[in-house]
């Protein structure tokens, strides 16, 4: 049902000139590679007789750290790359003075997206090349010239999967209250077919539209305490990898078959969504597998049916809703959609009508919560690895990151007078804000104990008078005797201790004879071994949950489910007097020491596990030959 190309136009719109509010002058210079697009930005738009102030924040959860893009190179080979350090221009936020408002916009070339005020959904897009201050059209979805689109998921296919549908299931909650559970994350992989690529004309245009779509989908799902994170984008710029049929059910089947074949070499994701430029038969614009999220059939197909990306975003949100176990609203007796205007439909309405929906009904929320009770939904609990998200450091998250001197949490929580919570810079006159060697905003004097000795394999640490952090935790020299064993990197590993760690308090090391052979895959005893440094053999205690065991006589070894690998005796475990397991063999203690390290410490320190001098209080590394006070005096006292 897609309108004929080029894109259909708006029937009725208002011309506005957005005005960007000056941002706060933050007292820190961040590196230029953080990009051109600010962390936060505000715009004033005069539309429908009102001045709307939009407060926006960059959606830093839009792309997962391992985000990849796959396309076909000029020579015909398939290329997958991980774009690094790219800035982006996709924002989310709210409208000032409207409690239940929402906004999702891109600012890449002018403003494009939507903002919702009460029951009105306003779409905005640039009319010319004038950038963010140029002429923009603001209009309502019903004024976009388009035909109603429907979802291809039939009532028959839903019935058996969703169970009985009665109003009793649904206990309405206030429209704006979030489910009081942990946030769930959908790690999304998007495939763009060749028809869509041809329609948009370039990889850059496809990337921009997909990020815009996913930004909108994410905003719609935030009301359900969900985040949608794009982990991969595949653009079929040369040819389709499977037949994209005008029959959406055939295309979905082909997508899922293709995905099953690709899973091993493509991103591990929770959900795959195809965006196609093919016009599906009839009025259908989307089709999905119901309750398939986290399974091999977790996916849907979406026709890009509207000029505005909000259109396909609503379709994707709807089809993803089916993947999450939701039924069409009209199939559920007593289902309440909180939309207040006449034609108001929620996201899971079977047909999107002439206006884009912006919220989920009470029954969609109830279906979702019931889906989340299934064990299969576990894939949604893991947050994507957010270690390299686009967008740089966050002031207010308790992590001192690039460009920050301190971080005491969000301004509303910060109680640290040494740190300015809005700039993450030290307060006037403060030397430090955090650390065990920081007191009253000043660095503690050298020699003050900052980390006491925990056990016989540990060493105590002292402030050095220069840094607010306690020096790195160091341990007794490897090979130092400890209870029943020898210290190794701060631990005192013994067979008994390892068996207790796996099998609980009743676990003990098995008889010595159990260690006298190796085990081959399939629990077969094999060749004789002369020491106790092979497979960890225990007896007694409780079998560890989720682990298979290999029993040979009275010897219990832990194995993987397929029986191909065994829990080894760890490095450093005592295997005899003055002997330790090292590289899988029982060896002499001197494997730990290359020389008499402690002799280099001038009687003012001892050797640590790294074969470095660990100085007594007040003495300076590396050889404990000078007092810290002398060293500081010579180099100028403080940081």
């Amino acid at each position: 049902i897609a309108p004929s190309r080029p894109w259909a136009l708006m029937e009725q719109y208002e011309v506005v000139l957005p005005w960007r509010l000056p941002g706060p002058r933050v007292r820190r210079a961040l590196p230029s590679h953080l990009g051109l697009h600010p962390e936060r930005v505000s715009y004033v738009l005069g539309a429908t007789g009102h001045n709307f102030t939009l407060h926006l924040r960059k959606n830093r959860d839009l792309l997962g750290s391992g985000y990849t893009e796959t396309y076909t190179a000029a020579n015909g080979s398939e290329v997958t790359e991980q774009p690094r350090g790219q800035d982006h221009c996709f924002y989310q936020g709210h409208v000032e003075g409207y409690p239940d408002s929402a906004a999702s916009l891109s600012t890449c070339a002018g403003l494009r997206g939507f903002f919702q005020v009460g029951s009105d959904l306003h779409l905005i897009e640039p009319l010319d090349e004038g950038g963010e201050g140029g002429r923009h059209a603001v209009y309502q979805a019903e004024h976009l010239l388009q035909t109603a689109g429907t979802c291809g998921v039939s009532d028959d296919s839903l019935g058996s999967l969703l169970g009985p549908r009665t109003a009793a299931v649904f206990r309405p909650r206030p429209g704006d209250s979030l489910p009081s559970r942990e946030t769930r994350y959908v790690e999304l992989y998007v495939v763009v077919d060749n028809a869509e690529f041809q329609m948009l004309g370039s990889e850059a245009a496809v990337r921009h539209r997909v990020l815009e779509v996913v930004n909108h989908v994410d905003k719609l799902y935030q009301k359900l305490n969900f985040r949608v994170v794009l982990v991969g984008l595949e653009i079929w710029n040369s040819q389709d990898r499977f037949h994209v049929s005008p029959d959406p059910s055939v295309t979905l089947e082909n997508l899922l078959t293709w995905q099953a074949r690709q899973r091993t070499r493509r991103h591990l994701h929770d959900n795959v969504q195809l965006i196609t430029g093919v016009d599906f038969t009839g009025t259908t614009v989307g089709f999905a597998r119901v309750s398939a999220m986290c399974s091999h059939s977790s996916g849907a197909v979406n026709q890009d049916h509207s000029k505005n990306p909000v259109g396909v975003a609503c379709t994707m949100a709807h089809e993803m809703g089916h993947n999450l176990g939701m039924d069409h609203d009209e199939n559920v007796q007593g289902c309440r959609c909180q939309e207040r205007f006449e034609a108001g439909r929620c996201i899971m309405a079977g047909s999107i009508g002439s206006s884009f929906p912006r919220m989920f009904s009470d029954c969609s929320q109830a279906y979702l919560e019931s889906f989340l009770e299934r064990p299969q939904s576990v894939c949604l609990a893991n947050a994507p690895d957010l270690s390299h998200l686009v967008g740089g450091p966050v002031c207010g998250n308790l992590f001192v990151e690039r460009g920050e001197q301190c971080d005491c949490g969000p301004p509303e929580d910060c109680r640290n007078r040494c740190c300015n919570s809005t700039t993450c810079q030290l307060a006037e006159g403060a030397q430090c804000a955090h650390g065990t060697c920081c007191q009253e905003c000043k660095v503690k004097p050298a020699g003050e104990l900052c980390r006491p000795k925990k056990d016989m394999c540990d060493l105590e640490e002292f402030c050095d008078g220069r840094h607010p952090e306690c020096p790195e935790d160091a341990f007794q020299e490897n090979g130092t005797p400890c209870s029943g064993g020898y210290c190794y990197n701060g631990a005192c590993p013994t067979l008994a201790q390892q068996c207790q760690a796996f099998w609980g308090p009743g676990g003990q090391a098995a008889e010595e004879s159990c260690f006298s052979y190796d085990i081959l895959p399939g629990c077969k005893a094999s060749r004789y071994r002369a020491d106790m440094c092979g497979v960890l053999q225990c007896k007694g205690g409780q079998q560890p949950l989720g682990r298979a065991i290999c029993i040979v006589d009275v010897c219990h070894a832990l194995t993987t489910e397929d029986g191909t690998a065994y829990e080894p005796v760890p490095e450093g475990t005592r295997c005899g007097p003055e002997k330790v397991c090292w590289k899988g063999r029982c060896q002499d203690l001197h494997v730990y020491r290359s020389s008499n390290c402690s002799a280099q410490c001038h009687n003012h320190g001892v050797c640590n596990h790294k074969q470095e001098c660990h100085c007594h209080a007040g003495w300076a590394p590396p050889h404990c030959a000078k007092l810290l006070t002398e060293v500081h005096a010579a180099s100028g006292s403080l940081p």
Partner: nanobody
């Protein structure tokens, strides 16, 4: 699979000390703000302390008596509790929240992983 496993809960006398440990697995530990919460009988679950790197935050009820720390090398977070009172009797939970999430540290919905809890009983 992500797991947070608390340990160290025990029964102690008023004025005693307890050190709770939380072992994290299956997540990029250094990317998470770790928090300790507790639920006392008949009360709501409340935040006690949170830690990033190297910063910490304490709720009023924990300031002065409790110390939160972490060991990124071992994927561990600890809560040292001193001068315990009978009102400290509760189930103590460890939780993790992405360092990239925003908003108050007290918003429990932002913590995406939770442990099963460990019981601490303080008697007179």
């Amino acid at each position: 699979e992500v797991q947070l496993v608390e340990s160290g809960g025990e029964s102690v006398q008023v004025g005693g000390s307890v050190r709770l440990s939380c072992a994290a697995s299956g997540l990029t530990f250094s990317n998470f703000i770790m928090g300790w919460f507790r639920r006392a009988p008949g009360k709501e679950r409340e935040l006690l302390a949170a830690i990033g790197d190297p910063s910490t935050h304490y709720a009023d009820s924990a300031t002065g008596r409790f110390t939160i720390s972490r060991d990124n090398a071992k994927n561990m977070v600890y809560l040292q509790m001193n001068s315990l009172k009978t009102e400290d009797t509760a189930v103590y939970y460890c939780a993790a929240r992405s360092r990239y999430s925003t908003g108050t540290l007290y918003d429990q919905t932002k913590y995406i992983y939770w442990g099963q809890g460990t019981q601490v009983t303080v008697s007179s």
